[in-house]
């Protein structure tokens, strides 16, 4: 439950356990940027090790406009988005998606959201004349959960300091929705 | 879970001011806008404003401006909303309700009764 | 200040039949509707938004039509869970008004 977001209508889903987003569309309309943001962590040892610090997430920076009913943001958010594997940071490949790359039977990481935060958004409608906003939650930073074979999805361990702590702020997403705001959502996403 | 918790009934004289306050469990309350909705005994719902508890930003209906007050404690994760010089017509329960945009109430507490009466 | 007026007032109905309420702005609103449930000494609960977008979790018997000025809540087959008041509300202009309610009654 932890890690399910609040309902944003009409912004992109933030992964549950067990989804993980695609990167977007390669330099689609030229907004994709900072490819590999959170890439370069120092490496110390072969990829069996147990160290945090050896397990690095992609952090992929893109730009859009929120949409929501016929009214539209007056200017960009920047999001991010986790992408799907972790690993060594020495072993890291260049391109993201080659699939698993290193021992099957040792344990299965991810990359997924670990902080949230809010934005609030100016949003321009046709004729109303209430100024009307929301605020989306958007990812501020992914980090690597570790998921051993043999354990279902809702057993992923944390790593890092915040692991032991209750996580504040973290909201539900609504499981179904609409299939205009899910429309909504495909319109203006990248 | 999203909730909103709202204090309980309360008993006032006209010309009073009443405090009701809403604590939000389930999210964080800057993520979102705390609106605040009355109605009276048998009538409708009437909306009375909204407020941004991130930056204090408020937009109040114009029939409560200047009588209404909507404040934050964001450490608490807490709503509050002081209506003052009440009187006999305010007597209604009064709603807090909070979503992630400005015009409309995803979320609603459970509501809270304000008997105005001398 | 916008006026919303929902007809019926009231309505009796069975299990199973079809029910619609409507909702008129006393000016165009463009799609910035919402319709909420509520049941007696709770709080209501949200429906649908932006006219005719289902609130996750609300059964799909319940839909939304209407742009502008006239808007349309209907239930496709009534379950005895649905006996209750319904609000439409507008979010295009300030202040935000609700329409005066339609109470929907066992038959």
């Known amino acids: 439950q932890g890690w399910q977001a609040f309902k944003n209508d009409a912004t992109e889903i933030i992964p549950e356990l067990g989804e993980y987003p695609e990167p977007p569309p390669e330099l689609e309309n030229n907004k994709t940027m900072n490819r590999a943001e959170n890439g370069g962590r120092p490496p110390h040892h072969p990829f069996e090790t147990k160290d945090v610090s050896e397990y690095s997430c992609r952090e992929l920076h893109f730009t859009r406009y929120v949409t929501d009913g016929q009214c539209r943001s007056a200017k960009p958010v920047t999001e991010l988005v986790c992408s799907g594997q972790c690993g060594p940071a020495r072993l890291l490949p260049n391109a993201i998606g080659r699939g698993k790359w290193w021992r099957p039977s040792g344990p299965d990481f991810r990359c997924i959201p670990d902080r949230y935060r809010a934005q609030r958004v100016q949003l321009l409608c046709p004729g109303g004349a209430a100024p009307r906003a929301r605020k989306v939650r958007l990812v501020a930073s992914c980090k690597c959960k570790r998921l051993t074979r043999f354990h279902n999805q809702s057993e992923l361990k944390d790593f890092g300091p915040e692991a032991a702590r209750p996580q504040k702020g973290r909201k539900p997403r609504p499981r179904a929705r609409g299939a205009k705001a899910n429309q909504a959502e495909l319109e203006n996403a990248y | 879970q999203v909730q909103l918790v709202q204090s309980g009934a309360e008993v006032k004289k006209p010309g009073a001011s009443v405090k009701v306050s809403c604590k939000v469990s389930g999210y964080t309350l800057t993520h979102t806008f705390m609106h605040w909705v009355r109605q009276a005994p048998g009538k409708g719902l009437e909306w009375m404003g909204w407020s941004d508890p991130e930056i204090g930003d408020t937009e109040y209906a114009s029939k409560f401006q200047g009588r209404v007050t909507m404040t934050e404690d964001t450490s608490t994760d807490t709503a509050y909303m002081e209506l003052s010089s009440l009187r006999s017509e305010d007597t209604a329960v009064y709603y807090c309700?909070?979503?992630?945009?400005?015009?409309?109430?995803?979320?609603w507490g459970q509501g809270t009764l304000v008997t105005v009466s001398s | 200040d916008i006026q919303m007026t929902q007809s019926p007032s009231s309505l009796s109905a069975s299990v199973g039949d079809r029910v619609t309420i409507t909702c008129r702005a006393s000016e165009g609103i463009h799609d910035a509707l919402a319709w909420y449930q509520q049941k007696p000494g709770k709080a209501p609960k949200l429906l649908i938004y932006?006219?005719?977008t289902l609130e996750s979790g609300v059964p799909s018997r319940f839909s939304g039509s209407g742009s502008g000025t006239d808007f349309t809540l209907t239930i496709s087959s009534l379950q005895p869970e649905d006996f209750a008041t319904y609000y439409c509300?507008?979010?295009?202009?300030?202040?935000?008004?609700f329409g005066g309610g339609t109470k929907v009654e066992i038959k």
């Open positions: 509300q507008q979010g295009d202009t300030l202040p935000y008004t």
């Open positions: 932006w006219a005719s």
């Open positions: 309700a909070t979503g992630d945009t400005t015009y409309k109430f995803d979320y």
